[in-house]
């Protein structure tokens, strides 16, 4: 015998009390897939959460975070306090980035400044708590007579004519 519940579309549930009739989900609930025997309770966006989209008969409510907080996790499952640029969130609250680190966002952690010398470059603009350093040309490129134009053509080996 075919399960009549499989015919029930999203937004309904299969009502066993009524010979497997498809009944619409009641208020404050939804079903996102067909064939469900119960509807799921709608998420409520309360406290630090605010509603981005209310619950429909086929989809759960979508939440955002109130001003001063940002979403973390899948489907904004958590709200984390914002900090200022140049800060990171610790267990004791927002703390300034230590010297040599920066954070250019209201969330996340302070990251070390780029080490320009690792790329053979020099620091063009110093870093701050809010901004990374800006690397410039290597010191050798800045020596007198050095040109930033096209590099010189390679020397030809003796006895070879150009192709």
């Amino acid at each position: 015998l075919q399960d009549l519940c499989s015919n029930c579309p999203a937004g309904t549930f299969c009502d066993n009390n009524r010979s497997q009739i498809c009944s619409p989900c009641p208020p404050n609930s939804f079903s996102s897939a067909g064939g469900q025997r119960t509807c799921d309770i709608c998420r409520q966006c309360k406290g630090v959460f605010k509603t981005r989209k209310e619950c429909s008969s086929t989809s759960n409510a979508e939440c955002d975070c109130i001003s001063g907080y940002h979403c973390l996790g899948a489907e904004c499952s958590m709200c984390e306090q914002d900090c200022k640029q140049g800060q990171e969130l610790t267990k004791k609250g927002c703390k300034d980035c230590c010297f040599g680190t920066f954070n250019d966002q209201k969330r996340g952690i302070c990251r070390p400044w780029t080490n320009c010398s690792l790329d053979g470059k020099s620091v063009l603009v110093n870093g701050t708590k809010e901004r990374d350093v800006v690397c410039g040309p290597s010191p050798a490129d800045l020596s007198p007579g050095a040109s930033s134009a096209t590099p010189p053509a390679p020397a030809r080996e003796p006895g070879h004519s150009p192709q």
Epitope: C25, P27, E54, C55, S57
Partner: antibody, heavy 119, light 108 residues
């Protein structure tokens, strides 16, 4: 599927109480957590929500009417009722009973019954 | 309490597209339903959950909802579409049902 049918007097005198009953057929009124609502429409005007009740007996009412209105459930008869007291000519309207389902959607509606307030 | 605003009337020639608006503060986060009411009859649900249609409602009826405006669109309008159209939401702050004032669609 559920069907709803309003019943009650079509004529009420001013200052008296308007009483209507909605009979639900094709389903149980106390199952599944649906809300059971009354809505009215004055002649030539728009729809006005009166209130609703749900299975716990809790009810919500339109603030403009809440001092005069009461909605009740009678699960043994599969009915819910509207009482509107101290009526005036301004309460003359077509009164609809209806079920509220997910996301506040109103479905189905009763066919409506005209109640005239007149001496 | 939450307020929904609809234009009192919209006129359209047969075969054209009718658009009826429903304005409300940040209505885009809410779920909007639309009802058609012909003279002397009870309202009939034509669009629910912003843009879904109940079975039996032709696909000429569609809805959209964003920002401060929800819209009911009827394409290829026919004389039989002449009716009053009401938008409706559930105001979750107050747990109240809210209707717009209704729009009378006239088919020229």
């Amino acid at each position: 599927q559920e069907q709803l049918q309003e019943s009650g007097p079509g004529l009420v005198k001013p200052s008296q109480t308007l009483s209507l009953t909605c009979t639900v057929s094709g389903g149980s009124i106390n199952s599944q957590g649906y809300y059971w609502s009354w809505i009215r429409q004055h002649p030539g005007k728009g729809l006005e929500w009166i209130g609703y009740i749900y299975d716990s007996g809790s009810a919500y009412y339109n603030p403009s009417l809440e001092r005069r209105v009461a909605i009740s459930l009678d699960t043994s008869k599969n009915q819910f009722s509207l009482n509107l007291n101290s009526v005036t000519v301004a309460d003359t309207a077509v009164y609809y009973c209806a079920r509220i389902v997910a996301a506040g959607r109103i479905d189905p509606w009763g066919q409506g019954t005209l109640v005239t307030v007149s001496s | 309490s939450y307020v929904l605003t609809q234009p009192p009337s919209v006129s359209v020639a047969p075969g054209q597209t009718a658009r009826m608006t429903c304005g409300g503060d940040n209505i885009g986060i809410k779920i909007v339903h639309w009802y058609q009411q012909k003279a002397g009859q009870a309202p009939v649900l034509v669009v629910y959950d912003d843009n879904d249609r109940p079975s039996g409602i032709p696909d000429r009826f569609s809805g959209s909802n964003s920002g401060n405006t929800a819209t009911l669109t009827i394409s290829r309008v026919a004389a039989g579409d002449e009716a009053d159209y009401y938008c409706q939401v559930w105001d979750r702050r107050s747990d109240h049902v809210v209707f717009g004032g209704g729009t009378k669609l006239t088919v020229l």
